[in-house]
Amino acid sequence: DLKVEMMAGGTQITPLNDNVTIFCNIFYSQPLNITSMGITWFWKSLTFDKEVKVFEFFGDHQEAFRPGAIVSPWRLKSGDASLRLPGIQLEEAGEYRCEVVVTPLKAQGTVQLEVVASPASRLLLDQVGMKENEDKYMCESSGFYPEAINITWEKQTQKFPHPIEISEDVITGPTIKNMDGTFNVTSCLKLNSSQEDPGTVYQCVVRHASLHTPLRSNFTLTAARHSLSETEKTDNFS
């Protein structure tokens, strides 16, 4: 009996530009002799329904139809026909099929590959054209994929140390697609510093499918109106 097992759940998620290993494990009743078996990996794009051959291994020869694609002969000996794809790109997402032949038996399995890109976040202060005591804080998120993203603003005061979501005076612009297929978006928070307590901490909170935990950038309102002290990769202002 010959069986193939792919990633549990049928979906694998990988970061953009990563060296991804798409799992495919072989279960066979006898020890595997790699010189008398064949492995073929196929890919079907999300945008068109045509299946393309990515990699082929048979006997004493292997061929990559996608540069760098490889199945390890050393791992194949112990039943691992996983496909390594270095530098995975957004357009390589889709359905991957692992087909194993141990003559006369054949088995196959499929998995969906999702490619994600994590946003970089930074805070900017824009005072151009603003009224007295009014500031506009911009939270820029860039280089993320897929497009769906959630940006919120929170504040913590000395009176209320638990974060409170701010809903007023928040404008989140449209997402902009970059040349590389990733997206950018900017969310703005308008503040009237005269009406806010010094020491209040404001946070821009970014949630995205690529992030295990939200990306947080913060600034503290001081008597001198503002002090950006961000915890993430951001621009700093004093």
């Epitope: 290993t21 799992f23 494990n25 490889i70 002969p73 050393w74 791992r75 112990s78 039943g79 691992d80």
Partner: antibody, heavy 120, light 111 residues
């Protein structure tokens, strides 16, 4: 920085078993196999076997088959080598080594070695 | 099993002079156009360290005075100018077939 840190020296009696651990850090544990190699005093290198942390698949040197068991715990990036029914000629330094398996097959980083002494 | 025979088993070299070690395999270690022969150096009291893989590719951080060549059954490790830090035992290893096997080692000393 890639590091393989092995457990300490062991002294065992003939017929006993020994389990050596190898804690990996500085790389993605499942991207490489783990080789085990031993070296008897004043002798050369001898390949025991390897394990694929991806699926737990093992390949053993026939010489050790039935006496050696290779395992991994991916949650703590640690590989283990257990050798049973020890004999005096199993006295050796046992090494774990990270093994590239996609673009060739070679051991590019080695543990510091674990000395196993089998003596009655 | 594939048997690897190294020659010489020991050599004594003056610093700055070249050195060469041969490794002969009992059968070809080539597969699909590549040679699965690796070279390691074991310095006294240390674990082995990788020098060369796939017969001729220098491992990162290894000085370029080391070079490897060969295919099929005949392989050579060369050191263009031996330095004091090169002392130790050199091993060839084939990884084409299991069990992966090592040569018996070549001990390099400085004159």
């Amino acid at each position: 920085e890639v590091q393989l840190v092995q457990s300490g020296a062991e002294v065992k009696k003939p017929g006993a078993s020994v389990k050596v651990s190898c804690k990996a850090s500085g790389y993605t544990f499942t991207d490489y196999n783990m080789d085990w190699v031993r070296q008897a005093p004043g002798q050369g290198l001898e390949w025991i076997g390897d394990i694929n942390p991806n699926n737990g698949g093992t390949l053993y040197n026939q010489k050790f088959r039935g006496r050696v068991t290779l395992t991994v715990d991916t949650s703590i990036s640690t590989a283990y080598m257990e050798l049973s029914r020890l004999r005096s000629d199993d006295t050796a330094v046992y090494y774990c080594a990270r093994s590239e398996v996609f673009y060739g097959n070679y051991a590019d980083y080695w543990g510091q070695g674990t000395t196993v002494t089998v003596s009655s | 099993d594939i048997v690897l025979t190294q020659t010489p088993l020991s050599l004594s070299v003056t610093p700055g002079q070249p050195a060469s070690i041969s490794c002969k395999a009992s059968q070809s270690v080539d597969y699909d156009g590549d040679s699965y022969m690796n070279w390691y150096l074991q310095k006294p009291g240390q674990p082995p360290q990788l020098l060369i893989y796939a017969a001729s590719t220098l491992h990162s951080g290894v000085p370029d005075r080391f070079s490897g060549s060969g295919s099929g059954t005949d392989f050579t490790l060369k050191i263009s100018r031996v330095e004091a830090e090169d002392v130790g035992v050199y091993y060839c290893q084939q990884s084409k077939e299991d069990p992966r096997t090592f040569g018996q080692g070549t001990k390099l000393e400085i004159k």
